[in-house]
Interface confidence: low
């Protein structure tokens, strides 16, 4: 029959070439002379000339060694024609299978593989996977079947078999307990891949296993005991820097310290924070310490990490003895701000009040007093007793110094400590009004017509407070009432000044006496300019000059 079974040819054949593989034969050769030919890739198309056929005998020839890794199978067509060129058979499939030889070594996909695993993990924990490839056939032969192995481990601590590798998958796992980053932070494994399932060619690579930090070391105070001296009253004062050592990875949560005051700070006077770079505990005062109340504090501080411990570890505790240093504290006025009511205008030398300070220090210090700020110079203060007396005229109506009836004075207390310290107090004198100002009209100059004159309305002001103000009364004196009339309008505290009789154009003095509810009288001279005009005027017109 015009059929050829698949032909198997090993790769890398040594020849001699051409090498006869199989004979094509048509049973039509009994009747006529047959000529044989082949077509297809490897024959008449690329790669051309690998195969040929003896034209008359039908022998299929191999002209050169084959490479399975390049072409694993050739599909050709065999043809048979008679002498006149007519086909005597249909084209026949010829399959040539290239069989594998172990002509390739395994190759790792990387020269160096990197993986990581937490310290302290249990045996069986997977670390990483390595991969090697082999171009040879791993389906029909073992030529391309790779087996993995660990050749060596560096360092060999705590022993030389810390890891294993799965021979067929390349998965590296922990095989022994005792991984400790603080002792060995990194292992270098020399790994091998061998084909023929471990019996063939070998290639080598490196697997670096980083041991990751777990919080298996507690921070430990070094030193554990501290003594510090802190001035009393200092807030935010750095008391002490506490130092810890931690074998875990620097700047990791397993290394970063968390400090806690666990004893000795009943009054919540202290606080502790972690310095981000040095990892020290910065102990500072949250409130001022009081030497007189307690001159020594013994604090207990515990340290842990930001990350929880992965196993039960002892907690380190530091003891800090804080000696409070006595500071000469300033005297404190009691109360800090004192309000005293006093009548304005009382005589010089009259007592206003006693204003004294207390000294927080234990020893009985002498305190002396003086006035620090007395804008008007109205007061004096006895340096020994703190007695405040009048030294000038207290004037409630003096707007330069008095605001809302209050005159503010700052006083000073100085102790005799070394160095001396000072405290200040505020004395607020509420000045009680007396009727020391009479009513005053505004304006004090008027212009008025001498014919059908408009009345002039003057506003009345009185610097005193009620009841030393309205209702007001008006009276014209010194014969001013002959020509003028004055009437008080109680509704709006004004006085209406009217011209009663004709006056020639000139300037006149109008003597107006105003008195308040307390009969405090004030005489004011109003300058009245009388003009030759009718009704309303603001300025006297120029006299008319005839032509």
């Amino acid at each position: 029959d015009w059929v050829v079974a698949p032909i198997s040819v090993p790769e890398n054949g040594k020849g001699p070439f051409p090498q006869r593989l199989n004979q094509l034969k048509s049973n039509k050769d009994r009747d006529t002379k047959i000529f044989y030919s082949i077509t297809g890739p490897g024959a008449d198309s690329p790669p051309e000339g690998v195969f040929a056929v003896e034209k008359e005998t039908g022998w299929l020839l191999l002209n050169k060694p084959l490479d399975r890794e390049e072409i694993a199978k050739y599909e050709l067509f065999g043809h048979a024609v008679s002498e006149n060129g007519a086909s005597v058979e249909d084209p026949m499939n010829i399959s040539i299978i290239v069989t594998d030889q172990n002509d390739h070594k395994p190759k790792f996909t990387q020269d160096t593989f990197r993986g990581s695993v937490l310290e302290g993990v249990l045996p069986g924990t997977s670390v990483m996977q390595v991969t090697a490839t082999d171009e040879d056939d791993a389906i029909h032969t073992y030529n391309g079947v790779v087996a993995y192995s660990i050749h060596s481990q560096e360092p060999k601590d705590p022993h030389d078999l810390m890891f294993t590798i799965h021979r067929s998958t390349g998965t590296i796992s922990v095989i022994s307990s005792g991984l400790d980053r603080e002792k060995v932070p990194e292992y270098t494994l020399t790994i091998q891949a061998t084909d023929m399932d471990g019996d063939g060619s070998t290639t080598t690579a490196v697997a670096v296993v980083e041991i990751l930090d777990a919080n298996d070391n507690a921070p430990v105070f070094d030193p554990q005991k501290y003594e510090s001296h802190v001035p009393e009253n200092a807030v935010g004062h750095e008391v002490q820097r506490l130092t810890v050592t931690d074998l875990d990875a620097p700047n990791s949560p397993a290394w970063r310290a968390t400090y806690l005051i666990v004893g000795g700070d009943d009054g919540d006077h202290f606080t502790i924070a972690t310095h981000p770079e040095s990892n020290q505990g910065i102990l500072t005062t949250r409130k001022g310490l009081d030497f007189e109340a307690k001159n020594q504090h013994t604090l207990y501080v515990e340290v842990t990490n930001e990350a929880p411990f992965v196993l039960k570890l002892p907690t380190s505790t530091a003891t800090i003895v804080v000696h409070v240093e006595d500071v000469n504290e300033a005297p404190v006025f009691v109360p800090p701000s004192k309000v005293v009511e006093v009548q304005e205008g009382i005589p010089t030398g009259e007592a206003v009040c006693v204003y004294t300070a207390k000294d927080p220090d234990k020893e009985n210090q002498k305190i002396s007093y003086r006035i620090l700020r007395d804008p008007a110079g109205w007061l004096a203060m006895d340096p020994d007793s703190g007695q405040v007396t009048v030294a000038g005229t207290l004037d409630r109506e003096d707007e330069r110094f008095v605001r809302n009836n209050i005159y503010e004075v700052m006083v000073l207390a100085v102790d005799n400590g070394s160095p001396p310290t000072t405290g200040t107090g505020t004395l607020l004198l509420t000045l009680i009004d007396v009727n020391d100002h009479g009513p005053v009209p505004e304006p004090r100059e008027i212009t008025i017509c001498n014919q059908s004159p408009e009345s002039q309305v003057l506003n009345i002001t009185d610097k005193d407070l009620s009841p030393h103000t309205s209702p007001f009364q008006a009276q014209l004196t010194d014969d001013s009432d002959i020509y003028w009339m004055a009437e008080v309008n109680e509704k709006d505290d004004t006085v209406v000044l009217s011209l009663k009789k004709f006056l020639k154009q000139d300037t006149y003095d109008v003597h107006l006496s105003l008195s308040d509810h307390g009969n405090k009288e004030q005489l004011t001279v109003i300058r009245a300019t009388v003009c030759d005009c009718h009704g309303h005027v603001e300025k006297c017109p120029d006299p008319w000059k005839g032509g």
């Epitope: 935010g236 004062h237 750095e238 820097r241 949560p253 970063r256 924070a273 972690t274 310095h275 981000p276 770079e277 910065i282 500072t284 930001e306």
Partner: antibody, heavy 123, light 113 residues
Framework: EVQLLESGGGLVQPGGSLRLSCAAS????????INWVRQAPGKGLEWVGV???????NYASSVKGRFTISRDNSKNTVYLQMNSLRAEDTAVYYC?????????????????WGQGTLVTVSS | DIVMTQSPDSLAVSLGERATINCKSS????????????FAWYQQKPGQPPKLLIY???TRESGVPDRFSGSGSGTDFTLTISSLQAEDVAVYYC?????????FGQGTKLEIK
Amino acid sequence: EVQLLESGGGLVQPGGSLRLSCAASGFSFSSYPINWVRQAPGKGLEWVGVIWTGGGTNYASSVKGRFTISRDNSKNTVYLQMNSLRAEDTAVYYCAKSRGVYDFDGRGAMDYWGQGTLVTVSS
Amino acid sequence: DIVMTQSPDSLAVSLGERATINCKSSQSLLYSSNQKNYFAWYQQKPGQPPKLLIYWASTRESGVPDRFSGSGSGTDFTLTISSLQAEDVAVYYCQQYYSYPYTFGQGTKLEIK
């Protein structure tokens, strides 16, 4: 008003020494770290070092072992002692107050600076 | 040491326009325990000492006009001047205070176009 005033700059030969002073006023001097920062002519800023409230110090690697920072809280003054001076130490030297007393105040930032003093190292 | 790199080295912007300066650090300046970036911006005018503008990467120092703003976290930071004024002409420096030694960027010169 916060004020920092540097003094002590001048011309010095290579290998020589110089002591700069920084007088401070207007704030609670003893409570704040003080930095030294320098600026070579026409160049950028270079941090030299810092002195903490308790007297502890940190230095840039370029000056470590040659420069020493100290402070006298009673005089409100910080000093920069410069030994084994080199031509590359030529710069305007500024002292600068740390922004805060504590890390959480942004202590590493510098909120007040002096006007600077010029140090020239040349033969 | 942490290296601070500013870009651009110089910048010309029209009055009233937005100016942006960048600063990149060679390692993260974000401290995980307090989520703060240990980073500051300064302004230096000719013949004057530097002036602190921004700390904690985005907190404006008191007295600094609100046209100045800082942003960014980790390794990348930006100073923005929303509307450039004539008095903003200066050299701007970034600084890290995450670890010692403190380091500054090389500076960015800002001019008016």
